[in-house]
């Protein structure tokens, strides 16, 4: 594989322990998706990460070892966006209400929703426990991080003709080598301290001219706030 020498996320690095305190792991007997804690009782993830039963794991770094900072809380409500489209992955966003409030501390804390859409060129942090190999399987135990820029909508649409909606944007590198991958879905893209993206899809991982595609959280702030208010 062209980019699998010490690849992390693909091409990232080991996050400093608990340096991404809003990152959660969604577990159904194994880690299947990421998510972001947006308040004490609600998590944002991807619509395609829907399962009828989910355990939300907060304060994780090594997901295979109990390190003492974890909080495991079952999902009480799982609300996929009403216009989620499985075929196109448009509206690929979901809210999870925790069955009890998370305890906020230095290792578990919330991330702010965006106040403006993501600007081209902005450097963002993507994180997750997804596959670190661009071909084959190498799933890490420890949380991986990747710094990557927001790409212009024109470059995004040119990479995926006819597939990019106004609810999606691209982050990454057209030269390949650095990207989110399988297992990172639902996880955060944080730019300037705001949750701008949710890991959604892409053609393969870290392939040339095939950057990662992310749900544009800014378009859903009203839906998120209304849904939380209606289910509190």
């Amino acid at each position: 594989a062209p980019f699998d020498d010490d690849d992390k996320i693909v091409g990232g690095y080991n996050c400093e322990e608990n340096s991404v305190p809003y990152q959660v792991s969604l577990n159904s007997g194994y880690h299947f998706c990421g998510g972001s804690l947006i308040n004490e009782q609600w998590v944002v993830s991807a619509g395609h990460c829907y399962k009828s039963r989910i355990q939300v794991r907060l304060g994780e770094h090594n997901i295979e070892v109990l390190e003492g900072n974890e909080q495991f809380i079952n999902a009480a409500k799982i609300i996929r966006h009403p216009q989620y489209d499985r075929k196109t992955l448009n509206n690929d966003i979901m809210l999870i209400k925790l069955s009890s409030r998370a305890v906020i501390n230095a290792r578990v804390s919330t991330i702010s929703l965006p106040t403006a859409p993501p600007a081209t060129g902005t450097k963002c942090l993507i994180s997750g426990w997804g596959n670190t190999a661009s071909s084959g399987a190498d799933y890490p135990d420890e949380l991986q991080c990747l710094d990557a820029p927001v790409l212009s909508q024109a470059k995004c649409e040119a990479s995926y003709p006819g597939k990019i909606t106004s609810n999606m944007f691209c982050v990454g590198f057209l030269e390949g080598g650095k990207d989110s991958c399988q297992g990172d879905s639902g996880g955060p893209v944080v730019c300037n301290g705001q949750l701008q993206g949710v890991v959604s899809w892409g053609d393969g991982c870290a392939q040339k001219n095939k950057p990662g595609v992310y749900t544009k959280v800014y378009n859903y702030v009203k839906w998120i706030k209304n849904t939380i208010a209606a289910n509190s």
């Epitope: 007997g29 194994y30 880690h31 299947f32 998706c33 991807a46 395609h48 990460c49 829907y50 399962k51 009828s52 499985r86 075929k87 992955l89 690929d92 997804g130 596959n131 084959g136 399987a137 190498d138 799933y139 989110s180 991958c181 399988q182 297992g183 990172d184 879905s185 639902g186 890991v199 959604s200 899809w201 892409g202 991982c205 990662g212």
Partner: antibody
């Protein structure tokens, strides 16, 4: 409860086709995929292919490409497997099994948690 | 394609014995392995998923371990209803492949 119920046993002549059905109940059909697995008499398990119940995306075993077609009918929560140009070595018990979807950048886990009871297909002249 | 090699192909054991079955993948599959039990004339039944997670309703005497290429299914204390054939399956990528099976027989 979650279950998959398959159609009854079939006896076919070489060169004919067979279509096996698998009716799902107890869960949301379109949230999962269906795999088809067969087992020849006294032999092990052989994966035939996979179909997404929501998008009808398919992935077939290479040795069966061109002879097998998997479909779904979401209105009746039923999956179908058609095998054409039957040969004697297609004699087997055919199983459908529920698996996870492969979508976006979700963890790919292709295990099968619920199985149908099996359909015996005998190919004989 | 990823080849799955199971060993032994058969094992004779007595009630109460500890039985270990191994499965080796021809390339790394991380934790994406499942174990099934099959009794004559019946459909396979999922025992273990994601290498070590016990399927709901399966007795705790069954356990799984391993990651990468080498995996193990252990029955800590064999019971009469455990005499069956056991299969591993790589769940990492298409085409899905199974091991050849291990038949656990009464000694």
């Amino acid at each position: 409860q979650v279950q998959l119920v398959q159609s009854g046993a079939e006896v076919k002549k070489p060169g004919a086709s067979v279509k096996v059905s698998c009716k799902a109940s107890g869960y949301t059909f379109t949230d999962y995929a269906i795999s088809w697995v067969r087992q020849a008499p006294g032999q092990g398990l052989e994966w035939m292919g996979w179909i997404s119940a929501s998008t009808a995306d398919t992935n077939y075993a290479q040795k069966l490409q061109g002879r097998v077609t998997m479909t779904t009918d979401t209105s009746t929560s039923t999956a179908y497997m058609e095998l054409r140009s039957l040969r004697s070595d297609d004699t087997a018990v055919y199983y459908c099994a529920r698996g996870t979807e492969v979508v976006g950048k979700m963890t790919v886990y292709l295990g099968m948690d619920v199985w149908g009871q099996g359909t015996t297909v005998t190919v004989s002249s | 394609d990823i080849q799955m090699t199971q060993s032994p192909s058969s094992v004779s054991a007595s009630v109460g014995d500890r039985v270990t079955i191994t499965c080796r993948a021809s390339q790394g599959i991380s934790r994406w392995l499942a174990w099934y039990q099959q009794k004559p004339g019946k459909a396979p039944k999922l025992l273990i998923y994601a290498a070590s997670s016990l399927q709901s309703g399966v007795p705790s005497r069954f356990s799984g371990s391993g990651s990468g290429t080498d995996f193990t299914l252990t029955i800590s204390s064999l019971q009469p209803e455990d005499f069956a054939t056991y299969y591993c399956q790589q769940a990492n990528s298409f085409p899905i492949t199974f091991g050849g099976g291990t038949k656990v027989e009464i000694k």
